[in-house]
Interface confidence: low
């Protein structure tokens, strides 16, 4: 009984961890699209899971690369 409980808890923990990167939970991953150049200056803001507004998806993606973070897109539009 105890072993089953521990197994279930572990499975739930794993599910919740993997859910953090899913599009249906916290948000979706920002894409850089073309890695050779910088981002355009087109203002089409996205709200990051860090609570900050980024001018476009590309900017958030490159910020992630620069800072070695994994901030997701919480929603389109400003936070």
């Amino acid at each position: 009984m105890k072993v089953t409980g521990i197994f279930l808890l572990s499975a739930l923990a794993l599910l919740s961890l993997s859910g953090n990167t899913g599009a249906d939970s916290l948000g979706r991953e920002a894409k850089c699209y073309n890695e050779l150049n910088g981002c355009t200056k087109i203002y089409d803001p996205v709200c990051g899971t860090d609570g900050n507004t980024y001018p476009n998806e590309c900017v958030l993606c490159f910020e992630n690369r620069k800072r070695q973070t994994s901030i997701l897109i919480q929603k389109s539009g400003p936070c």
Epitope: C32, Y33, N34, N37, G38, C39, T40, K41, I42, Y43, D44, P45, V46, N56, E57, C58, S76, G77, P78
Partner: antibody, heavy 120, light 110 residues
């Protein structure tokens, strides 16, 4: 997938123009929509656009008298232009702006255009 | 401002020949450039995007090149159906723009 502009017509100087672009087959949450016009015998002129997020941006000449809005439920994007003059006589196009791809930004789907004539 | 200058304004080419149209940006726009073809009384048609990527369904006789401020559209093996006006458009900046399009180049096929 298509975009279609509402009917244009004859307007008087100082009138306000409102055009509607109806989109079908794709979501306004996934694509930007741009407005472009073309005066008779002239080239293409960018008016502005509304992004996936609902943020609007405008050409510098259009900023003071143009407003672009959208209704995601009705799948429509509207262009409102105030203080019309004869110089605003043109065919007005709406077009889908795929700006997701960043340097791949392009107007890949165009309406047939609608003629707006401003004359007293 | 990000201004686009197209040259020449008009060009005449024989069937089977090659035509080159240039587009210059006043500031660097990376490769965020598209080319369109427009025939009289018709809507513009996307030919090239990302400076060099061929749009779906477009003949490989059309090709684009360039980055930064200098761009080129080349039409090889010109056909009568290529008679049209061609426009470049920058997709790099939207907040400081008079016109995202170049002035156009009329291609006359003889």
């Amino acid at each position: 997938q298509s975009v279609k502009e509402s009917e244009g017509g004859l307007f008087k100087p100082t009138d306000t123009l409102t055009l509607t672009c109806t989109v079908s087959g794709f979501s306004l949450s996934s694509y930007a929509i741009s407005w472009v016009r073309q005066a008779p015998g002239n080239g293409l002129e960018w008016i502005g656009a509304i992004g996936k997020s609902g943020s609007a941006y405008y050409a510098s000449w259009a900023k003071s008298r143009s407003t672009i809005t959208r209704n995601t439920n009705l799948n429509t994007v509207s262009l409102k232009m105030t203080s019309l003059t004869a110089a605003d006589t043109a065919t007005y196009f709406c077009a889908r702006w795929d700006s997701v791809g960043w340097t791949d930004a392009r107007l890949d789907l165009w309406g047939q255009g609608t003629l707006v004539t401003v004359s007293s | 401002a990000y201004d686009m200058t197209q040259t020449p304004a008009s060009v005449e080419v024989a069937v089977g020949g090659t035509v080159t149209i240039k587009c210059q940006a006043s500031q660097s726009i990376s490769t965020a450039l598209a080319w369109y073809q427009q025939k009289p009384g018709q809507r513009p048609k996307l030919l090239i995007y990302g400076a060099s990527k061929l749009a779906s369904g477009v003949s490989s006789r059309f090709s684009g090149s360039g980055s930064g401020t200098e761009f080129t559209l080349t039409i090889s093996g010109v056909e009568c159906a290529d008679a049209a006006t061609y426009y470049c458009q920058q997709g790099y900046e939207t907040s400081n723009v008079d016109n995202a399009f170049g002035g156009g180049t009329e291609v006359v096929v003889k």
